[in-house]
Interface confidence: low
């Protein structure tokens, strides 16, 4: 049975140019991650965070894509183009898979405030 | 085809060191990583760990901590495993082995498909 | 670490028997679970991969169950080459194999 929960930093904006924390963290479970996926809202993987080999960043995004902190990832050099849906997919034993939802506002002004709550979706 | 191909029988002393490779073809060597597994004569299988071809990580049998060191060089496809202080109790046939756990997989599958000879490493005084 | 205990050690059978080999993990593994094959001097070979999934070029009559922490490793209709010894192994990190079934002619 599936106890766990993912929370996530729910819906953040941030300012063109700026950089921006994707963070989910899985609770209420005692399920080991053995990899957590990253994807954009076009289902393009921008990382991959295995247990045991490591992080892996596609190359299409390794200028912009940082690993970390944690299980999270930082985007960097934010473009209008990057607003929209992040999924990260926690594959777990002996529990199986979770999935958590971020939406990401990439905003013109300088006054874009970038929330780093955490919510659960 | 696929084929992990290992280095000759050794024979060493008490104390002494033992370094073993393992010579992989016909798949993309950083695509796994690769395992090391030992046998003692008459004995069932122990596995010792493990080093990513990608980016070098290891995890190695904590029983083996501090002496065991494994090392890959990506230019050749050859896998290396170095076994420090060695002990009679260190006799064995060491293995290498392809781990099947990727990147692409979100499964730890772990399973070893392709298994090197062996190397017989004999340790006497 | 996860231990693997393996049973029976060891099991006398003929050609044609149906063959029964069991692995219980201290705890739930899923269904990370391997199985092999290993014949003196050589090196162990791949049958089961993720308790049940065959490998490629493995006959058919080998199959593989179970998830949680039971496992069963079936020979359905024993071969002569099948004489052997059978060792599971969890792929939970850090790996660790079982002791071992060794199945000889009765």
């Known amino acids: 049975m599936m106890t766990g929960t993912i929370e996530t930093t729910g819906n953040i904006s941030a300012k063109k140019g700026g950089s921006v924390i994707l963070q989910c963290h899985l609770s209420s479970t005692m399920a080991q991650v053995t990899q957590v996926n990253w994807e954009q809202h076009d289902h393009s993987l921008l990382a991959i965070r295995n247990a045991e080999l490591g992080w892996h960043i596609y190359p299409a995004f390794k200028d912009r894509v940082a690993p970390g902190p944690g299980l999270g990832l930082t985007l960097q050099s934010l473009t209008m183009n990057d607003t929209g849906e992040y999924f990260c997919t926690y594959h777990t034993y002996p529990d199986g898979t979770y999935r958590g939802r971020i939406f990401l506002e990439v905003l013109e002004s300088s006054v874009a405030e970038h929330s780093a709550r955490f919510q659960i979706p | 085809q696929v084929q992990l191909v290992q280095s000759g029988a050794e024979v060493k002393k008490p104390g002494a060191s033992v370094k073993v490779s393992c010579k992989a073809s016909?798949?993309?060597?950083?695509?796994?990583?690769i395992g090391w597994v030992r046998q003692a004569p008459g004995q069932g299988l122990e596995w010792m760990g493990w080093?990513?071809?990608?980016?070098?990580?290891?995890n190695y049998a904590q029983k083996l901590q501090g002496r065991v060191t494994m090392t890959t060089d990506t230019s050749t496809s050859t896998a290396y495993m170095e076994l420090r202080s060695l002990r009679s109790d260190d006799t064995a046939v060491y293995y290498c082995?392809?781990?099947?756990?990727?990147?692409?997989?979100?499964?730890?599958?772990?399973?070893?498909?392709?298994w090197g000879q062996g190397t017989m490493v004999t340790v006497s005084s | 670490d996860i231990q693997m205990t393996q049973s029976p050690s060891s099991l006398s059978a003929s050609v044609g028997d149906r063959v029964t080999i069991t692995c219980r993990a201290s705890q739930s593994i899923s269904s990370y679970l391997n199985w092999y094959q290993q014949k003196p001097g050589k090196a162990p070979k791949l049958l089961i991969y993720a308790a049940s999934s065959l490998q490629s070029g493995v006959p058919s009559r080998f199959s593989g169950s179970g998830s949680g922490t039971d496992f069963t490793l079936t020979i359905s209709s024993l071969q002569p080459e099948d004489f052997a010894t059978y060792y599971c192994q969890q792929s939970v990190p850090p790996r660790t194999f079982g002791g071992g079934t060794k199945v000889e002619i009765k």
């Open positions: 080093i990513s071809s990608y980016n070098g990580n290891t």
């Open positions: 082995a392809r781990d099947l756990s990727s990147f692409w997989s979100g499964d730890v599958l772990g399973a070893f498909d392709i």
């Open positions: 016909g798949y993309t060597f950083t695509s796994y990583p």
